[in-house]
């Protein structure tokens, strides 16, 4: 807390600018008026103030806003982000995405922040969904987003929001993401033809079920070791040999180097040995 | 990677100006303030003043602002300070340095140019 | 302006020893400290910054503490390879300002 003092003669802040970096605190303090600089915002960034400086600025914004600040303030808040708590955010009604894009940006380059997640939170629930454009936003700043989000979080995301997904953006998802995440994408994707569907629904294969998979299997897709070891283990159980040999295709030699791990152990285990023998891998059941 | 490439040294005579140089890599220039830090033999630091490569805003600590300029080259990613009116104790090393924003710790230094100033 | 003051210019150390360098302020700065390694001939290199936090890279045995006025960074182990000027600076407010720097010596 600032103490309040009266601005010494000559030091009452005219407008806001770069002068304002040699201000003591408590200048700031007693010599810019909170009114000016919430109009002047759009400045702020662009002025080195110190970490320390920034405390009072924003304890000025806070006693002029009280129940939050409008959006007019909040896209230009720049570093001043930083010292926002989730509380703060809390009390915030941010509608526009080149607001969302602006905040984000100060934080880039850092891992997801409770004030940033906050924030997504607010821009999201008053979306009311997940729509493309904000999805193809946060997964550009954080491509891991999409895999923080919960089974019951995603199920609000609709299918056209699918496009904008990469399939790095689900590296870090697990299958129960993937279970809602897969139907989504298959919606999304179902005009595509073959070679093109399977490039597009890869990455959300495991959430497929193993009816997709024995579907999948006539298609000559070739699917890589990679995307067979990320499949649901009880996708894969029931599948012949001739099926998943038929869905790797000349990617089924791999089998031999994974035979120990999941799923390729279990499925293993579930094949007549006769079946395993007629892919000449040497593989036991 | 970021770099900041500095000239070894600058011999000067007393009276007489010289314009040091400082070459920015790996790094988009015009992101990041550019400030300038003196150091005397067996001394400690003295922070001279930044500017920002796009706009050409500068801000001087008030005991280098007659002694010092500041200026940039955008197309050549170069910040230039001009020391004026040369004495002995202008002779030190001064080193041009990246901060982090918005707070002014140095993560990224200038290799150091050491004036000397001697007839 | 604000004025650091590293009181101990020198200091004598052993490998292996715990060192702890001070720090103190001419006025509270919060935790807008920064600290810095220089070995002769080089330029500075960021150790510490917002006194407590350990930059990229740079090894788990030193660490940084204080607020306010005090501050200080310790070396919980150390090695023959820090030996050097180290230096702290203040970035609460303007002008920016850093301590004289307390050198490292074998004893």
């Known amino acids: 807390e600032v103490e309040k003092t009266a601005c010494p003669s000559g030091k009452k802040a005219p407008e806001i600018d770069e002068s304002l970096i040699f201000y003591k605190k408590w200048e700031l303090e007693a010599c810019v008026d909170a009114a000016l600089l919430a109009t002047q915002m759009d400045r702020v960034n662009a002025i080195p103030f110190t970490y320390e400086q920034l405390d009072v600025l924003k304890h000025k914004l806070d006693e002029l806003y009280p129940q939050g600040y409008p959006e007019s303030v909040i896209q230009h808040l720049g570093y001043l982000f930083l010292k926002m708590s989730p509380e703060d955010i809390r009390k915030w009604n941010v509608t526009s995405l080149e607001t969302l894009k602006a905040l984000l940006e100060v934080n880039k380059g850092h891992e997801m922040s409770p004030q940033v997640a906050t924030l997504i939170d607010r821009f999201v629930k008053g979306r009311g969904q997940l729509d493309k454009d904000t999805l193809d936003t946060l997964t550009a700043f954080y491509p891991g987003y999409l895999c923080s989000l919960s089974p019951e979080e995603l199920s609000s995301v609709p299918p056209s929001s699918i496009w904008a997904v990469r399939p790095q953006d689900l590296d870090t998802c697990d299958p129960r993401q993937l279970d809602v995440l897969y139907p989504k994408a298959r919606l999304a994707f179902q005009n595509m033809n073959g070679s093109e569907y399977f490039v597009k629904i890869q990455s959300f294969l495991g959430g497929a079920p193993t009816e997709d998979l024995k579907a999948l299997s006539q298609q000559n897709v070739s699917m890589d070791l990679a995307t067979f070891m990320k499949l649901r283990t009880d996708a894969v159980l029931p599948l012949t040999v001739a099926e998943v040999q038929k869905l790797l295709g000349p990617h089924v030699e791999g089998l031999k180097a994974e035979e120990r791990h999941r799923p390729v152990r279990d499925w293993i285990l579930r094949q007549r040995q006769d079946d395993l023998d007629t892919l000449g891998l040497g593989l036991q059941g | 990677q970021v770099q900041l490439q500095q000239p070894g040294a600058e011999l000067v005579k007393p009276g007489a100006s010289v314009k040091l140089s400082c070459k920015a890599s790996g790094y988009t220039f015009t992101s990041y303030w550019m400030h300038w830090v003196k150091q005397r033999p067996g001394q400690g630091l003295e922070w001279i003043g930044m500017i920002h490569p796009n706009s050409g805003s500068t801000n001087y600590n008030e005991k280098f602002k007659s002694k010092a300029t500041l200026t940039v080259d955008k197309s050549s990613s170069t910040a230039y300070m001009q020391l004026s009116s040369l004495t002995s104790e202008d002779s030190a090393v001064y080193y041009c340095?990246?901060?982090?924003?918005?707070?002014?710790?140095?993560?990224?230094w200038g290799t150091g140019t050491t004036v000397t100033v001697s007839s | 302006d604000i004025v650091m003051t590293q009181s101990q210019k020198f200091m004598s150390t052993t490998v292996g020893d715990r060192v702890s360098i001070t720090c103190k302020a001419s006025q509270n700065v919060g935790t807008a400290v920064a600290w810095y390694q220089q070995k002769p001939g080089q330029s500075p290199k960021l150790l510490i910054y917002s006194a407590s936090n350990r930059y990229t890279g740079v090894p788990d045995r030193f660490t940084g503490s204080g607020s306010g006025t005090d501050f200080t960074l310790t070396i919980s182990n150390m090695q023959s390879e820090d030996l050097a000027d180290y230096f702290c600076q203040q970035s609460s407010s303007y002008p920016l300002t850093f301590g004289a720097g307390t050198k490292l010596e074998l004893k």
């Open positions: 340095a990246r901060p982090v924003v918005p707070y002014w710790y140095f993560d990224v």
